[in-house]
Amino acid sequence: SQVSQNCHNGSYEISVLMMGNSAFAEPLKNLEDAVNEGLEIVRGRLQNAGLNVTVNATFMYSDGLIHNSGDCRSSTCEGLDLLRKISNAQRMGCVLIGPSCTYSTFQMYLDTELSYPMISAGSFGLSCDYKETLTRLMSPARKLMYFLVNFWKTNDLPFKTYSWSTSYVYKNGTETEDCFWYLNALEASVSYFSHELGFKVVLRQDKEFQDILMDHNRKSNVIIMCGGPEFLYKLKGDRAVAEDIVIILVDLFNDQYFEDNVTAPDYMKNVLVLTLSPGNSLLNSSFSRNLSPTKRDFALAYLNGILLFGHMLKIFLENGENITTPKFAHAFRNLTFEGYDGPVTLDDWGDVDSTMVLLYTSVDTKKYKVLLTYDTHVNKTYPVDMSPTFTWKNSKLPNDITGRGPQ
């Protein structure tokens, strides 16, 4: 049903869903702090622009009685319950921030007449692609897929002279929310990744993964997995690995690789790590030592969501345009705004663009080094280290099929 929005006469409210089931187990207090920081900055920016208006946030909490798994598995109905709560209280703001779970976002988008914008820190799955009033501020699965296809096809770099067309994907069902949807996208038979590859097999058991490492009859030398180095070590341990195996470890929201004192463990030598360019993370700040890297990005996405709303509000107010219109709801895309740590770009479908970084372990220094970067906005790869000190023969990535190219 249509809910009146607290969104006019110089008073603009943001509805923030504080769901018990969330993409990351972040204390709600940290998200509140991030939202409040965003509000302070937005108020300052609007004031500097000569716009004398009030901007506030209403935090909508789930009762947690029914939907209490704490992760995204029971989030589908929780999101709708919160919307019902908003509806009953007649407390809808100009914009909805949250939810972060793919299940809940998809269902809320499906089951509501969305004449207001929805900003999500998460909603990584392909089912949340191309939604007209949804903005996602953490890299969705589609962006990862496009990088992988781009990288697989690349064959004109000094360190990668073969196009690849095959891959194994390790997916055992215990992944975090981001990894779950990233791997789900790679597994989906109708996805761009599957369409572009000639061979792709999903490994679901630890033993399957372990056997492939030395299997002479393997169909691909490349294995994609998602998680941190510790996750890989638990699975791989100190097992021998064939010299032409390449493990691609997707670990987007972990910037610990960029710390000065980090040394790559030996088991990472045949691994390429895909992560995001770190920017000014909250890393090393003693305030956030108790936060995992992903959670820092999660809180930052909430903060940037507030700043994005402030950016759009400022534009519409300066143009004398109404906020409670479909035009406003559809405007949160194809733009760049000033985020907390600098410019943030959204693509034509409201998804955040970023610089992905592919790292390798230098056999000389045992440090993680940048091999190449990838700009998701233009779908382009930029080599950084033209003479990498790889573990692989001739300092080149092997062919993806055993028996061809450097072994």
Partner: nanobody
Amino acid sequence: QMQLVESGGGLVQAGGSLRLSCIASGLTFPTYAMGWFRQAPGKEREWVSCVTRSGGDTLYADSAKGRFTISRDNAKNTLFLQMNSLKPEDTAMYYCVAALFCHNLRLNTGNYWGQGTQVTVSS
């Protein structure tokens, strides 16, 4: 161990200017919001200004707006407060402060504090 060391305070006539500096050590400077508080004799500590960790946004108390400018140099781990058109009521001990967010800093929740530098404005 984190250390914030202020400098630049002193005695100045009303209408004059001062530039306060604060050098941070023992912390990753670009990951903190930085700001200034002040405390006049016999009064409570009062928030003056804050700058976000990238330096992209600055926030000011009403008493500082239009006269004070906060800035930071992340490469040199240094925070600045340029104070112009000083008034006798600006006389106070000025403290450099670090926090995760300006929001936390302003509310003084989990702040790191320097020892302060004295500013005296004579009429």
